[in-house]
Amino acid sequence: ATKLTEEKYELKEGQTLDVKCDYTLEKFASSQKAWQIIRDGEMPKTLACTERPSKNSHPVQVGRIILEDYHDHGLLRVRMVNLQVEDSGLYQCVIYQPPKEPHMLFDRIRLVVTKGFSGTPGSNENSTQNVYKIPPTTTKALCPLYTSPRTVTQAPPKSTADVSTPDSEINLTNVTDIIRVPVFN
């Protein structure tokens, strides 16, 4: 059994979440990868995904989310820029492997965004907003969304849970639909 763990990031509005998801490059280098949010009482919702097949070092931007897949390092870099309080929640990286079930990569990210800035005077807290220059509208990616055929009645665990897993990836639910997913606006 594998412990499904969380890592917490506490950030202020306007700041950037920057995480890297480690995957087995021989198995998954060209597989499509996605960034999902897990809301209480719901199945994971895909917010952004790489192309299929995933392109090496090619940034994919969906709203304020930027994905970069580095095949030679076996890393998916995820950035969420100009964070808002409503972005707070539980997130995860997954790898799509049709027709197999998708795999989740460790760890889940518990993002807590609060108002105001924590910086000392003179620190450039808002630098990421200037660097990335996010356009007001971007193309919303078409990503698979994997949902359970059963109605969800209970939220995913907020702490750790035992799940059976091959290697370091966790089996998610069965594939039932592919839909266009709303993203951050």
């Epitope: 890592e7 506490e10 995480v19 480690d22 390092h73 076996g74 460790f106 630098s127 990421t128 660097v131």
Partner: antibody
Amino acid sequence: EVQVLESGGGLVQPGGSLRLSCAASGFTFNAYAMSWVRQAPGKGLEWVSTISGSGSTTYYADSVKGRFTISRDNSKNTLDLQMNSLRAADTAVYYCAKVAGSNFFFDHWGQGTLVTVSS
Amino acid sequence: EIVMTQSPATLSVSPGERATLSCRASQSINANLAWYQQKPGQAPRLLIYGAYTRATGIPDRFSGSGSGTEFTLTISSLQSEDFAVYYCQEFIMWPPWTFGQGTKVEIK
């Protein structure tokens, strides 16, 4: 509880070899990258090497590249560092460290093992 | 290679006082910074990651701030167990992942 414990340190002559080992427990070992970080006597911390959770990706500091080899056995929850062509400058306490699941920082450290390279 | 510079090298503070440690990166690392505490004869311990987030079990008297190239670790009211050496480390993307040279916080 996450635990990492190093072993294998000792005294070795310049040009010699040594193999360090690290036994890990309390977490899903194959899900996390692992690293070696060293600290020369009275000095600061220096990152040495990192290996991904699956073992498919390895990274080395320029100072050890071509001389040190990092490896892991996920069936035994162990991490190794094979050190060849050792130099006096390699004298340090070597720490085994678990890499966080979301970024390349070190969330759990072993107590370290001392490697002394001297004739 | 990103160079991390900490200041001051030594900070003399009385128990109960506030301590402010600085760390500067040679190029922007956004918030990809961690702080560690190391006591004599012991392994380092993670205090802060992502520039602001306290690691599990770290008291709230420790706080991190800054982004880009300038970072600060603040200890609001120094306790006897806080006297140690503190290191910052960047983890923006690729190796080498570098540490600052350390700041020693000693009793005044």
